[in-house]
Amino acid sequence: LIIGFGISGRHSITVTTVASAGNIGEDGILSCTFEPDIKLSDIVIQWLKEGVLGLVHEFKEGKDELSEQDEMFRGRTAVFADQVIVGNASLRLKNVQLTDAGTYKCYIITSKGKGNANLEYKTGAFSMPEVNVDYNASSETLRCEAPRWFPQPTVVWASQVDQGANFSEVSNTSFELNSENVTMKVVSVLYNVTINNTYSCMIENDIAKATGDIKVTESEIKRRSHLQLLNSKAS
């Protein structure tokens, strides 16, 4: 969480941002909130990006003002216009690209004063893994697949019964480049699986950590997946 204060002749206002991560090819949100104003026409929101000449987005006098928008953001940004009046300056970003990563500044002017806060935005790819029993294999084998990751993650297997065991010798992980030549499909196979046990396939890079669990018993198979972003810090 980053909290910034204005340092102008007018009073300063509190602006709060939250560091976040964008999944390339999908939409992202750059979070920013501020002390609201009672009059929409008095609020100015400017989003800037370090190293970029033009603006990322500008909203003033109750409407978007994009004449100074940088080319890399054209047609890709929107504020939640109906929420500006309650202090939400968050920015929606369409079709997140790797190059969108960097330091952003949310700069606010209201009748109460000015304020700004920076936001670190990471970009990459992350997806939920799915663990299945591989019935084609000669021995009991589990197959963990996740369709989109970038940068290349690490994959670690764990088991409830054999806690702390190292499965690197009995697993094999491969990374297959997807058609857009950036993200990769992750496939990890675990051999010599025993029944009545819960296995976890953990995939992690510097942006996200995802876990796929499978519980294999004689009578049923239960699955569960979980994904967590690693860098959601507020400013």
Epitope: K63, D64, E71, R74, A78, K94, N95
Partner: antibody, heavy 119, light 107 residues
């Protein structure tokens, strides 16, 4: 309310150029992009290009070499120029405005102007 | 280019019928799909944007759903004024593209 009005259509000889205008009202050209879409007789919709609030443009690659979109913010007007016209360019040409700045659909359309390419 | 394949290309139905038109994108387009209604000699009218958001003034019988590659426009109970041609379009990546259209006719 938001309005877009195209003008400049008519009969154009093959090989010649076409210049259309789209006069807008009810919104600012510094807030929204303006798209151009055409529809050949009895056919579907084909996206041609867009001019953004900043003045930068994106074109359908199939028309890149012969299409120019420009605007005059003070006149609230967008201009569309296509060169080297051929018979298959015969169509109704529309300008349209996005529903949101993030382009989730084309909310407001002009009435369209018919361009016939014929000698 | 992303191809938008609409089906069916034509459809006969009666007033009061529930009608579904589908649109399949050749690549993932998120939720950047819009649906339009067009009547002869008129400009298209936006019905649905962002895959599922009904545009201002559009009757509630029109609804949209889907994400990724598969999208649907549903008219819950056809009214006489709904007989027209419907198009889907994607605005996820350039060039923006449209489906070939579905002509909805009176049975």
């Amino acid at each position: 309310q938001v309005q877009l009005v195209e003008s400049g259509g008519g009969v154009v000889q093959p090989g010649r150029s076409l210049r259309l205008s789209c006069a807008v009202s009810g919104f600012s050209l510094t807030s929204y992009g303006v798209q151009w879409v055409r529809q050949a007789p009895g056919k579907g919709l084909e996206w041609l290009g867009v001019i953004w609030s900043s003045g930068s443009t994106d074109y359908n690659a199939a028309f890149l070499s012969r299409l120019t979109i420009s605007k005059d913010n003070s006149k609230n007007t967008v201009y569309f120029q296509m060169n080297s016209l051929r018979a298959e360019d015969t169509a109704v040409y529309y300008c349209a405005r996005d529903v949101t700045t993030i382009v989730e659909g084309f909310a407001h359309w002009g009435q369209g102007t018919l361009v016939t390419v014929s000698s | 280019d992303i191809q938008m394949t609409q089906s069916p290309s034509s459809l006969s139905a009666s007033v009061g019928d529930r009608v579904t038109i589908t649109c399949k994108a050749s690549e993932k387009v998120g939720t950047y799909v819009s649906w339009y209604q067009q009547k002869p000699g008129k400009a298209p009218k936006l019905l649905i944007y962002g895959a599922s958001n009904r545009y201002t003034g559009v009757p509630s019988r029109f609804s949209g759903s889907g994400s990724g590659t598969d999208f649907t426009l549903t008219i819950s109970s056809l009214q006489p004024e709904d007989f027209a041609t419907y198009y889907c379009g994607q605005t996820y990546s350039y060039p923006f593209t449209f489906g070939q259209g579905t002509k909805l006719e009176i049975k």
